[in-house]
């Protein structure tokens, strides 16, 4: 009956402010509709970064203005968060919900600490 979600403990964003990680879940049932939400926890505040609902076997589709993209394969979701800056460093938590068919199940990962380092500005060249 358990719904466990696993994600890496730490990820370093690249110089372009992009971070990727895998969110993997152990499904207690055969879900056809899954919702994945990325939450950011910083200073005891929790905000929703992005969310997508997808049908098993189909692609993950975030809203057009979302900073997230992703692909799904079985019980794995590959998430990419773009446009990150140093101030966005924090704990990014993957929440997975098996929306359909009943019963509903929910699982939450322990979070991935994403570190973002703003690139040094290029020195002026004369």
């Amino acid at each position: 009956k358990a719904m466990h979600v696993a994600q890496p403990a730490v990820v370093l964003a690249n110089s372009r402010g992009t971070a990727s990680f895998v969110c993997e879940y152990a499904s207690p049932g055969k879900a056809t509709e899954v919702r994945v939400t990325v939450l950011r926890q910083a200073d005891s505040q929790v905000t929703e970064v992005c969310a997508a609902t997808y049908m098993m076997g189909n692609e993950l589709t975030f809203l057009d203005d979302s900073i997230c993209t992703g692909t799904s394969s079985g019980n794995q979701v590959n998430l990419t968060i773009q446009g990150l800056r140093a101030m966005d460093t924090g704990l990014y938590i993957c929440k997975v919900e098996l929306m359909y068919p009943p019963p509903y199940y929910m699982g939450i990962g322990n979070g991935t600490q994403i570190y973002v380092i703003d690139p040094e500005p290029c020195p002026d060249s004369d």
Epitope: K1, M3, T53, M99, P103, Y104, Y105, M106, I108
Partner: antibody, heavy 119, light 108 residues
Framework: QVQLVESGGGVVQPGRSLRLSCAAS????????MHWVRQAPGKGLEWVAV????????YYVDSVKGRFTISRDNSNNTLYLQMNSLRAEDTAVYYC????????????WGQGTLVTVSS | EIVLTQSPGTLSLSPGEGATLSCRAS???????LAWYQQKPGQAPRLLIY???SRATGIPDRFSGSGSGTDFTLTISRLEPEDFAVYYC?????????FGPGTKVDIK
């Protein structure tokens, strides 16, 4: 701040219908699962129904399946519970409650509205 | 359906004493997705604990939650006059979401 205000309760005869409303404010309504929880006089809490996010997915406790319908209007930040074929055992205070980011536990509740089913 | 059983049904204690409330599930459920609520007469319930052990915002640290699997505990270290109320546990790992029958903490 988050506010949930229920309305629509009252006295109704067995077999009749009633619609409850819950007006929500102070948060992004469409980002949360919304629930109805009831409490019969002098009894404990009973979860009744949930509707998620865009309104497509809904679940109910067995005792109200086929009689109650939960719905939401995200443009007006309002939650509804349509109650048909009411029975005496449906008499209760009905609370609307907000699920949380970390799961369907309830950090905010309305004040409740009393539904009395009696002939 | 996960059935929650709470014990004792009633706990008679004096202010300043400690209280231990138990919640037992009929089956193990997802990763300690258990919440505790306090309810006073004529009021809506108030969230105390979620995730079995995390205190909700604004809840004093005399309230603590523990447990895993099927056995969970709410502990009130020193009862204040405002703590006399009914306490409910709730599981939210899977539908239907269920509450325990409640434990009433009253003044001895």
């Amino acid at each position: 701040q988050v506010q949930l205000v229920e309305s629509g309760g009252g006295v109704v005869q067995p077999g009749r219908s009633l619609r409850l409303s819950c007006a929500a404010s102070g948060f992004t309504f469409s980002s949360f699962g919304m629930h109805w929880v009831r409490q019969a006089p002098g009894k404990g809490l009973e979860w009744v129904a949930v509707i998620w996010y865009d309104g497509r997915n809904k679940y109910y406790v067995d005792s109200v399946k086929g009689r109650f319908t939960i719905s939401r209007d995200n443009s007006n930040n309002t939650l509804y519970l349509q109650m048909n074929s009411l029975r005496a055992e449906d008499t209760a205070v009905y609370y609307c409650a907000r699920g949380e980011f970390f799961g369907e536990f309830f950090d905010y509740w309305g004040q409740g509205t009393l539904v009395t089913v009696s002939s | 359906e996960i059935v929650l059983t709470q014990s004792p049904g009633t706990l008679s204690l004096s202010p300043g004493e400690g209280a231990t409330l138990s919640c037992r599930a009929s089956q193990s459920f997802s990763s300690n997705y258990l919440a505790w609520y306090q309810q006073k007469p004529g009021q809506a319930p108030r969230l105390l604990i979620y995730g079995a052990s995390s205190r909700a915002t604004g809840i004093p640290d005399r309230f603590s939650g523990s447990g895993s699997g099927t056995d969970f505990t709410l502990t009130i270290s020193r009862l204040e006059p405002e703590d006399f109320a009914v306490y409910y546990c709730q599981q939210y790992g899977t539908s239907p979401f269920t509450f325990g029958p409640g434990t009433k903490v009253d003044i001895k």
